[in-house]
């Protein structure tokens, strides 16, 4: 077959409509003409283009492409001339006041806050070098500068991740049922039976020594005494495989030493060698039948009528002749569209592609970042770029505690707390919010402030039975949370002043609940008998069920506002799952009765998921596109639940709609909540009455006793509509018609007394510290049994 | 600064009532529990009521109850002890208090109860 | 409720001298425990708070420890505006009590 990518030697042939005919005959796609890319093969389709001018937030390749200036000098070349690469374009390249230059030899600018940072942004590793030391003086520093507690040196765990902080120990005996590597040399322990079982496992490789094992090492090609049987060969790694498979073209071996030492040419005078080495009679080559497995004695035999020759076949891009026929196939990032053209490929279709933002061009894509961060050339993922260093913050039953995400140095945030659970932040305040089972009550206190407990104010200590989920809207300075003993869900200003019940009925175990104060809408899990993922808007409107099958025991669940997905965690089916936030496109992303043992809180940020496991005392981190990459991030936690991401670029600013409108709240008389945006005509925002109150005709104030009137009525999440006569204290959409799509109504329970001789802060007995039982069942006693009540929580 | 102010102490005869007033400043006032403690003279620090911080929830000891209720004002930061049916044994000094968590964390300076005929 | 005895009632001390004044609760109170000074004629003033946390502003010689049931209040180096009643309170469980009171004088 002649080579597929010339054409026109055959007679003229005229294309398709929506199809450009180049002079060398070919056919393409009208589109691709003056698309600044040569698909005719001889320029013809770029010929006679108007001259393109590159925008001012472009830059102008040498040959006129235009391409984003920020693809400038980023390491790969989007200029079909490299140019946007080259040495010229580069080295004039000065770094802005917010880059860190990657010294002389580099031509790369890396956010300035990537500096010792603990990762090589830079290829030599310049954003790291001469680093001054960061950790306390009660702290270990890494070789990789993280900070560590002494606590964890010399433990015989890798805590830095570079092992530097169990290097120069004093050896630890070994156990009774383990072998020591290296003899007296003082390397490390593992367990007796990885010894001689054609396993490296210590790094002197000592475990697989010859006189140790009664066989020459594993480095001996093929001693009779080193594998099992005859019938296998022994790879100088170490392993055995099976005999046949020297020298059979494929590697076996780790080492690939089966295909090391190969004679060639084994095939007699009268025979051909295949592709695969393996040999055929010469008359077969070129009879058109396969002989070879590979069908190697029928390439590249001419015979035949040769299409590719006539107008390249009628291909789009490459002709390949064949026996019979002839076949069109496309180069890397195209697909056939109808046999014979060549269209894109869409990468991006795949939600992981990129780990944020993808843009599909023609013949391959671009990963690209979000505001506020940067593409980490090494990695190729968006990392943060603006801001603080990221850290993690997690409750522990009896303490806050916070883990820097960067120099990985661990503090304790808030100590000697009864029996905490949920907890969640507002960045831009620097405070933090806390429930607390045995006090039955919601704080709040700053950052700084917060291990002083004079200084921690409660927002909720009334008609509050066991909150065990928390969530901050920071943009309309709201907090929601779940309780499974009332049975509710509810919303309070961040200060506690101003409270309402959104939701009473068809909730059995409320759980974990975040919220997308950007989009309007609230998420919360229920692991009860009919355990699901609901969402609704930050107003009680429009409730509907995300997850209902495949679902046990959903503890936290995160949101990630960026790709709009909802990640949860499965303590019963022993999972990690996403959805996006219409409830579509499910993915198990890990799934794991030893990562996963019991999870019970989540959170995502950049490019990892983290989540907390009850069981295995821990906390965990996964890339969150696949799933791979788990890892330790902390250990011998005793009970971690709730878990959090502190940094500014998980609560972006966005308008509170309820402040920007004409009069202050909204006009509202008590809460004005944001409602759902889902179409352009959603209204932005409804009010709100306290749970003994309802709403008046004007959508605004409230009243003690309902206000008659005909035209109000209220639409119910549960049943839609109710007669005006049965309205419920309520929320509004605030519309120019009275249709009031509010909350359900809630159920008014008896009146708490007044006086109660002794306040709930139950005292904690020992023995009910821990959960109920010790596989870790979804509930806890709540420490008093004085209260009558029991809390759960995973 | 955190300020608290009390009044209305003073003498009064066993049987009748008796009300204290806090003024308090330099803090977000509904968002802390709020206590009396009292001290006899020469005597110990004594644990009397707490107040939610909505006014929903009240406690009480065992030896006031039903005679003494607590109260406040959020929109007036102002905290207040309803004393009836006094007895000579609650002669004391009487501190408003901003609680902490498990402790007292501002005291105010103390209003003088007298209880006797 | 829980009972807090404290003791001694009273003692006096030499300027320098160190002190110690011990609280006993009468269930564990898992470190829920504040120390106060009261000098003469004037309030309560937090000192300690769960057990050993010195609260800002109170100088470094005041310290506190124990664990469970037991707990003291050490002052190392006394001096004379350390004078007052001191008073420990168990904030474990409500209703808060407190012990009776211990009366440092100087020598």
């Known amino acids: 077959a002649a080579d597929p990518l010339l054409g026109g030697q055959g007679p003229a042939k005229d294309c398709e409509k929506d199809q450009f005919q180049c002079r060398n005959e070919r056919c393409i796609p009208s589109v691709w003409r003056c698309d600044e890319d040569d698909d005719c093969l001889d320029h013809s389709d770029e010929d006679d283009c108007p001259k393109k001018t590159c925008a001012d937030s472009d830059f102008t390749c040498d040959n006129g492409h235009c391409i984003h200036e920020r693809w400038k000098c980023d390491g790969e070349e989007e200029c079909p001339d490299g140019s946007d690469e080259s040495e010229a374009t580069c080295t004039k390249q000065v770094c802005p006041a917010e880059k860190l230059s990657c010294g002389p030899t580099s031509h790369k600018c890396v956010p300035a806050s990537w500096r010792c940072d603990g990762e090589k942004d830079c290829e030599g590793g310049a954003d790291e070098a001469g680093c001054a030391t960061l950790c306390a003086p009660h702290e270990f520093q890494c070789g990789n500068r993280s900070c560590l507690a002494a606590v964890f040196v010399c433990d015989g765990d890798d805590d830095c991740g570079d092992g530097s902080d169990e290097r120069g120990c004093a050896d630890p005996a070994c156990g009774p049922r383990e072998f020591r590597c290296g003899g007296d040399g003082g390397g490390a322990c593992i367990p007796e039976r990885w010894v001689c079982d054609r396993q490296f496992d210590c790094e002197d490789r000592s475990d697989e020594a010859a006189e140790l094992c009664g066989r020459p090492g594993p480095g001996a090609t093929s001693a009779p005494a080193a594998c099992a049987t005859a019938s296998q060969f022994a790879c100088r790694s170490g392993e055995c495989v099976h005999l046949g498979w020297r020298c059979d073209g494929d590697r076996d071996c780790k080492d690939k030493s089966d295909e090391a030492d190969c004679p060639l040419g084994t095939c007699r005078g009268d025979e051909f060698q295949c592709g695969d080495g393996t040999c055929v009679l010469a008359i077969k080559h070129c009879n058109q039948e396969q002989d070879c497995p590979d069908g190697s004695d029928e390439a590249g035999c001419l015979q035949g009528l040769n299409e590719c020759l006539h107008n390249n076949g009628g291909c789009s891009h490459i002709c390949t002749d064949l026996k019979i026929g002839f076949e069109c196939t496309c180069p890397a990032g195209f697909q056939l569209l109808d046999q014979k053209t060549c269209g894109d490929i869409d990468e991006c279709k795949d939600p992981d592609a990129c780990s944020q933002i993808c843009v599909n061009y023609k013949g391959y894509f671009k990963c690209e970042c979000y505001p506020g961060y940067e593409m980490d050339l090494l990695t190729k993922n968006c990392k943060a770029a603006a801001g603080k260093s990221p850290s993690l913050i997690f409750t522990n039953r009896h303490e806050v505690r916070r883990i820097d995400l960067v120099k990985r140095n661990y503090s304790r945030l808030i100590p000697m707390l009864k029996n905490v659970v949920a907890l969640d932040v507002e960045v831009a305040t620097n405070r933090i919010y806390w429930c607390d089972l045995s006090y039955r009550k919601i704080y709040s206190a700053y950052m700084d402030k917060a291990s002083d407990p004079k200084e921690q104010e409660v927002l909720i200590d009334e008609q509050l039975h066991s909150p065990e989920g928390l969530a901050v809207d920071w943009v309309h300075k709201h907090i929601y949370w779940t309780d499974s003993g009332n049975k509710t869900i509810s919303v309070a200003t961040v200060d506690g002043g101003r409270r309402r019940t959104l939701f009473s009925r068809n909730l059995s175990e409320p759980r974990a609940i975040a919220v997308d104060p950007l989009r309007g809408f609230m998420y919360w899990s229920d692991w009860g008998d009919q355990a699901k993922i609901e969402k609704s808007g930050l107003n009680g409107v429009d409730r509907q069920t995300l997850v209902s099958d495949n679902i046990e025991w959903p503890n936290g669940i995160t949101l990630d506002l960026l790709s709009q997905r909802l990640y949860w965690v499965d303590s019963k089916l022993h999972q990690l799952s996403s959805i996006d936030f219409s409830g579509g496109n499910r993915k198990t992303l890990i799934s794991s009765t030893d990562f996963l043992s019991h999870p019970f809180g989540i959170a995502v940020f950049e490019d990892k998921v983290f989540w907390t496991d009850l069981e295995n005392e821990a906390i965990f981190s996964a890339n969150r596109l696949n799933g791979l990459e788990i890892s330790i991030l902390a250990e011998n936690l005793n009970n971690p639940h709730d878990i959090v991401i502190f940094h500014e670029l998980k609560q972006p600013r966005a308008p509170d709609a309820c402040e920007l409108s004409v009069q202050p709240n909204g006009g509202c008389e008590y809460l004005c909540l944001p409602a759902p945006q889902i179409s352009s005509h959603s209204p932005k925002y409804t009010c709100a009455c306290p749970d003994t109150m309802w709403l008046g005709p004007d959508m605004k104030r409230c009243y003690r006793a309902p206000q008659s009137t005909s035209t109000t009525t209220l639409a119910s999440t549960m049943t839609r509509t109710v007669p005006a006569t049965t309205r419920a204290p309520g929320t509004t959409v605030h519309r120019s018609t009275y249709q009031n799509h509010s909350t359900e109504t809630p159920s008014l329970t008896a009146a708490v007394p007044s006086s109660v001789s002794v306040p709930r802060a139950p005292s904690i007995s020992p023995s009910t510290l821990s959960p109920a039982t010790s596989n870790h069942s979804q509930h806890y006693a709540n420490e008093d049994s004085k209260m009558g009540s029991t809390v759960t929580a995973a | 600064e955190v300020q608290l102010v009390e009044s209305g102490g003073g003498l009064v005869q066993p049987g009748r009532s008796m009300k204290l007033s806090c003024a308090a400043s330099g803090f977000t006032f509904s968002s802390f529990p709020m206590a009396w403690v009292r001290q006899a003279p020469t005597k110990g620090l004594e644990w009397v009521a707490t107040?939610?911080?909505?006014?929903?929830?009240?406690y009480y000891r065992d030896s006031v109850k039903g005679r003494f209720t607590i109260s406040r004002d959020n929109a007036k930061n102002t905290l207040y002890l309803q004393m009836n049916s006094l007895r000579s044994e609650d002669t004391a000094t009487y501190y408003c208090?901003?609680?902490?968590?498990?402790?007292?964390?501002?005291w105010g300076q103390g209003t003088l109860v007298t209880v006797s005929s | 409720d829980i009972q807090m005895t404290q003791s001694p009632p009273s003692l006096s001390a030499s300027l320098g001298e160190t002190v110690s004044i011990e609280c006993l609760a009468s269930e564990d109170i898992s470190n829920y425990l504040a120390w106060y000074q009261q000098k003469p004629g004037k309030s309560p003033q937090l000192l300690i708070y769960y057990a050993n946390s010195l609260e800002d502003g109170v100088p470094s010689r005041f310290s506190g420890s124990g664990s469970g049931t037991q707990y003291s209040l050490k002052i190392s180096n006394m001096q004379p505006e350390d004078e007052g009643v001191y008073h420990c309170q168990q904030g474990y469980n409500y209703p808060y009590t407190f012990g009776a009171g211990t009366k440092l004088e100087l020598k």
């Open positions: 107040v939610s911080t909505r006014g929903g929830h009240t």
């Open positions: 208090i901003r609680e902490g968590t498990s402790l007292f964390a501002y």
